[in-house]
């Protein structure tokens, strides 16, 4: 008896982080023994959709002409084979943005910023929401993200960062989201510029921490449970 | 019990579009594909389509492609069937099957069908 | 597209008989192959799914089998109900394919 069929890989392009109204193409790859190939969505109760194998049979696409909020959430795929199903592929997690308004991102006391001191990067939106996140660009893990306890609505976080050197210097954006949908990313905020100068080469900071906020070394991510996808947002901007 | 009940006869004239309806109970409507099945007289079936009632995903026959189109209205659990640029050929009784999602991907309950008759 | 292919496109028996219908597909459909009953004027109904499973309600006089390209259909004691255009299908690929259909008379 032959062990269990490998699983499939199931990647997003052109990422995993996707505009309203923009096209994305979801692939599985498989075997070349591939017969057939099923899409799953969580909370979907028929399979997503199924498609035949392309030539030479070990993947298939999923085509997403324009995105929408339907189309935002948690995937997997499987392939049959002449013995029959595959396991599930890992989760593949499609996020939308442009769900809501965008926020406006700001620092305080100033973009410009000397190496050992503090700054602290605002993100306010006009509506109140619960998880804020700030991307920055070209990070290995540009993923940082505040929620608020208890699912309390507010219409700020802050991301205190402290002492500053010039690993933080860069481009930052921000989102807003509500936590009835992880999937679901405001408009990205206007770019924000941070500058550090006079740098002092000391060694990678561990920012401030306080209750209120979740914001992580580029190299360590505060992930909780429950936050918005890693995956898909690292991926997109990297 | 499973049922799925069509739209009645259509006469229509070439080049015009017929629109079947296909409305199912008994079960729950956005769980299983549904798969729309023409027979033509005296031939046998052809398979047009298929369709998710939960999103509306789709895929057809190559042969169908550019004219028949597959909707959904979750609202009413029916699903329907457009047919347009029709000519005599596609004279048939047009069938509504839902999909048993499991080995064999099988057509497990069928509506009784809608004679459509394209005739000058 | 696999094309299926049905033998003989239609047969004579006698109540009591056992009958046995073929399909051969143009390629491995990997056991996913169907067969449905279906009566003058009315719906097709299925009858056996994945090769030789027996749908609800489906008596059991009705059996299929076969793998790989080939695959038969058995009515093991015919009955004057029994009389219809029988088709396999299969489940493999799409788009979904038919067998152009066994005509089954009583003699």
């Known amino acids: 008896q032959a062990g269990p069929l490998p699983k499939p890989t199931l990647w997003a392009e052109p990422g995993s982080v996707i505009s309203w109204g923009n096209s994305v193409t979801i692939w599985c790859q498989g075997t070349l023994e591939a017969r057939e190939y099923r899409l799953d969505k969580e909370e979907s109760p028929a399979p997503w959709d199924r498609q035949n194998p392309l030539e030479p049979k070990n993947k298939a696409r999923f085509s997403i002409p324009s995105m929408t909020e339907d189309y935002a959430g948690r995937y997997r795929c499987y392939y049959r084979s002449p013995v029959g199903w595959s396991q599930p592929s890992d989760p593949l997690e499609l996020v939308m943005t442009g769900a809501y308004s965008k926020p406006t991102l700001s620092a305080l006391p100033s973009p410009l910023v000397t190496s050992g001191k503090s700054v602290t990067l605002l993100c306010q939106s006009r509506s109140p929401m619960d998880t804020f996140l700030l991307i920055k660009e070209r990070a290995a893990h540009p993923l940082l993200h505040l929620r608020s306890e208890h699912g309390a609505q507010q219409h700020q976080a802050e991301f205190p960062m402290s002492p500053v050197t010039s690993v933080h210097g860069g481009t930052y954006r921000c989102f807003s989201s509500h936590g009835f949908s992880h999937y679901l990313l405001s408009h990205p905020s206007d770019p924000l510029e941070l500058i550090v100068s006079g740098s002092l080469e000391d060694p990678r900071p561990s920012p401030t921490r306080s209750v209120s906020t979740a914001a992580g070394p580029e190299d360590q991510p505060l992930m909780p449970t429950g936050s918005v996808p890693h995956s898909g947002l690292r991926r997109h901007w990297e | 019990q499973v049922q799925l009940v069509q739209s009645g006869a259509e006469v229509k004239k070439p080049g015009a579009s017929v629109k079947v309806s296909c409305k199912a109970s008994g079960y729950t409507f956005t769980s299983y594909w549904m798969h729309w099945v023409r027979q033509a007289p005296g031939q046998g079936l052809e398979w047009i389509g298929e369709?998710?009632?939960?999103?509306?995903?789709?895929n057809y026959n190559e042969k169908f492609k550019s004219r028949a189109t597959l909707t959904v209205d979750k609202s009413t659990s029916t699903a329907y069937m457009e047919l347009s640029s029709l000519r005599s050929e596609d004279t048939a009784v047009y069938y509504c099957a839902r999909d048993r999602y499991d080995e064999g991907n099988a057509m497990d309950y069928w509506g009784q069908g809608t004679t459509v008759t394209v005739s000058s | 597209d696999i094309q299926m292919t049905q033998s003989p496109s239609s047969l004579s028996a006698s109540v009591g008989d056992r009958v046995t219908i073929t399909c051969r597909a143009s390629q491995d459909i990997t056991n996913y192959l169907n067969w449905y009953q279906q009566k003058p004027g009315k719906a097709p109904k299925l009858l056996i799914y994945?090769?030789?499973r027996l749908h609800s309600g489906v008596p059991s006089r009705f059996s299929g089998s076969g793998s790989g390209t080939d695959y038969t259909f058995t009515i093991s004691s015919l009955q004057p109900e029994d009389i219809a255009t029988y088709y396999c299908q299969q489940g493999d690929t799409l788009p979904r394919t038919f067998g152009q259909g066994t005509r089954l008379e009583i003699k």
């Open positions: 994945y090769t030789s």
């Open positions: 369709i998710n009632p939960s999103n509306g995903r789709t």
